[in-house]
């Protein structure tokens, strides 16, 4: 189920790469965030809490990522035209339950000015 397009700037370009921003409400305590390209899982990050509220961060499909209290950023480098596609943030909420999944996304347009190694 696609809940809709991201209602925020999902793609931030810099230095021939792109930061893909996946937001979630900051009261979510435990979750898994997956970055999908089309239907393929590119990256994931899982945040869980153990006894004593110790936080554990795990990735099965590792990308360079950054976690804040209300977003996960995934970074893609060396952009080329093949990166142009629909990208989705697939959020699975474990805590607080009930378990919930939500999918938001947008289309990543690649323009010449954003490519990593343009010919001058």
């Amino acid at each position: 189920e696609i809940n809709g397009s991201a209602n925020y700037e999902m793609f931030i370009f810099h230095n021939g790469g792109v930061q893909i921003l996946c937001k979630y409400p900051d009261i979510v305590q435990q979750f898994k965030m997956q970055l999908l390209k089309g239907g393929q899982i590119l990256c994931d990050l899982t945040k869980t809490k153990g006894s004593g509220n110790t936080v554990s961060i795990k990735s099965l499909k590792f990308c360079h990522s950054q976690l804040s209290n209300n977003s996960v950023s995934f970074f893609l480098y060396n952009l080329d035209h093949s990166h142009a596609n629909y990208y989705f943030c697939n959020l699975s909420i474990f805590d607080p339950p009930p378990f919930k999944v939500t999918l938001t996304g947008g289309y990543l347009h690649i323009y010449e000015s954003q490519l990593c190694c343009q010919l001058k």
Epitope: N3, N7, K23, P25, I27, P96, P97, P98, K100, T102
Partner: antibody
């Protein structure tokens, strides 16, 4: 500081549609608010969950009342609206809206709705 | 649906007493249980979430325990302001369900 307040009619006639509005402050659905729910309590009875709407517009309803309930949100106005069709005297209750976290951590003061002809 | 059964439905106690209220779920809900306090003509107030975590600002005389199907709310030393009705609620799955309430009265 999170606050919620219910508004709407306090008296409705049988078969009419009830529309209640929850206006909230201190959180924003999507950034630091997961969702808003509605709960009711008939006089002298227990609490009953009715409906909930998430920041992403995902909606959940009590199965026994699903056919009569609609929940919507207007994030720009910080409001959540519950409509309940075909009201009956047994629907007389105090209706509460509440902020969804682990359970419901903040509640409105409630609005007593009486169904009578 | 998960049924939540509270016992007793009412109890009489004195200031300073230790009070225990139980809540039983019809199927396992892990630790996804909340407790609320409600005074006459007032909205419920959240006391405990995740079975044993105290909400901010709630006095430490309130405590919760349990997991799976059996849960307990304990007031270690009853105070005059604690006379109220207490409800449990499961939020493991939809539909969200509440217990029938336990009224704590003055003996």
């Amino acid at each position: 500081q999170i606050t919620l307040k219910e508004s709407g009619p306090t008296l409705v006639k049988p078969t009419q549609t009830l529309t209640l509005t929850c206006t909230f402050s201190g959180f924003s659905l999507g950034s630091n608010g997961l969702g808003v729910g509605w709960i009711r309590q008939p006089p002298g009875k227990a609490l009953e969950w009715l409906a909930l709407i998430y920041w992403d517009d995902d909606k959940r309803y009590s199965p026994s009342l699903k056919s009569r309930l609609t929940i919507t949100k207007d994030s720009s106005k910080n409001q959540v609206v519950l409509t309940m069709t075909n009201m009956d005297p047994v629907d007389t209750a105090t209706y509460y809206c509440a902020h969804r976290n682990s359970g419901f951590d903040y509640w409105g003061q409630g609005i007593l709705v009486t169904v009578s002809s | 649906d998960i049924q939540m059964t509270q016992s007793p439905s009412s109890l009489s106690a004195s200031v300073g007493d230790r009070v225990t209220i139980t809540c039983r779920a019809s199927q396992g809900i892990s630790s996804w249980l909340a407790w609320y306090q409600q005074k006459p003509e007032k909205a419920p107030k959240s006391l405990i979430y995740a079975a044993s975590s105290l909400q901010s600002g709630v006095p430490s005389r309130f405590s919760g325990s349990g997991s799976g199907t059996d849960f307990t709310l304990t007031i270690s030393s009853l105070q005059p302001e604690d006379f109220a009705t207490y409800y449990c609620q499961q939020y493991n799955s939809y539909p969200l369900t509440f217990g029938g309430g336990t009224k704590v009265e003055i003996k």
